[in-house]
């Protein structure tokens, strides 16, 4: 039984439009327990957006966020 489990943030699907980079405040990668890989971007308006980690723009944003950390 998974009693008292903390829900893990996964992605049902991904945004189909590239988010402007200046909207992004932070990101985190979804757990390996998720059925599909995902990157969740946190926007400056505190909205969370699921993105496809295999897309080039997603990899660039993640790299840039890491460099600026």
């Amino acid at each position: 039984s998974l009693a008292a489990d903390t829900p893990t943030a996964c992605c049902f699907s991904y945004t189909s439009r590239q988010i402007p980079q200046n909207f992004i405040a932070d990101y985190f990668e979804t757990s390996s327990q998720c059925s599909k890989p995902g990157v969740i971007f946190l926007t400056k308006r505190s909205r969370q957006v699921c993105a496809d980690p295999s897309e080039e723009w997603v990899q660039k944003y993640v790299s840039d966020l890491e460099l600026s950390a």
């Epitope: 903390t6 829900p7 943030a9 996964c10 992605c11 049902f12 699907s13 991904y14 945004t15």
Partner: antibody, heavy 120, light 109 residues
Amino acid sequence: EVQLVESGGGLVQPGGSLRLSCAASGFSLTGYAMHWVRQAPGKGLEWVGVIWPGGGTNYNSALMSRFTISKDNSKNTVYLQMNSLRAEDTAVYYCARGPLITTEVSMDYWGQGTLVTVSS
Amino acid sequence: SAEVTQPPSVSVSPGQTARITCSSNTGAVTTSNYANWVQQKPGQAPVGLIGGTNERPSGIPERFSGSSSGNTATLTISGAQAEDEADYYCALWYSNHWVFGGGTKLTVL
């Protein structure tokens, strides 16, 4: 402000077809899933299906051979095409917005619904 | 095929705690079923209450909470109020589709 407005319901004969529309405003379909859910008179909610931002779909297996979900991102509108309609398809049909993250409410905003009546 | 079961009705006195359960015929209800709860008042469209087992959208009062343990997901309404009288539906995700329970009518006596 997020708003969902369904239209296209009405009276249709058994065996007929109908296309419902759900016009979304206050957000873009490119960042959200869109669900269709129906409710027969005096009954509970039944999930019909979903269309994802990229256009992929999943359906209630009992309905998928007759129902098709599509969308037009330029119009920010989702459609439910219903074919070979039966009396048991009589229901209020709702569209609902679906955030993509599993921890969030998966049908957070709902329209007011449109009534489909299948009768001869 | 998956079936989701809820009690048809639950009664509670104002200010008391109401619990509405949701079970699956496939076994344990886990966090991978992303249990969602929807409220529907008579003559109105449904409203999303709880998602991902226990996430509340803004505007939903804190007295509504969700949990999952073993075979059951539970919606808890702490300090039920007259305006909470409504039908409550549980929805569970099964890999590629949602299944709603039959709904529970909450009566606040």
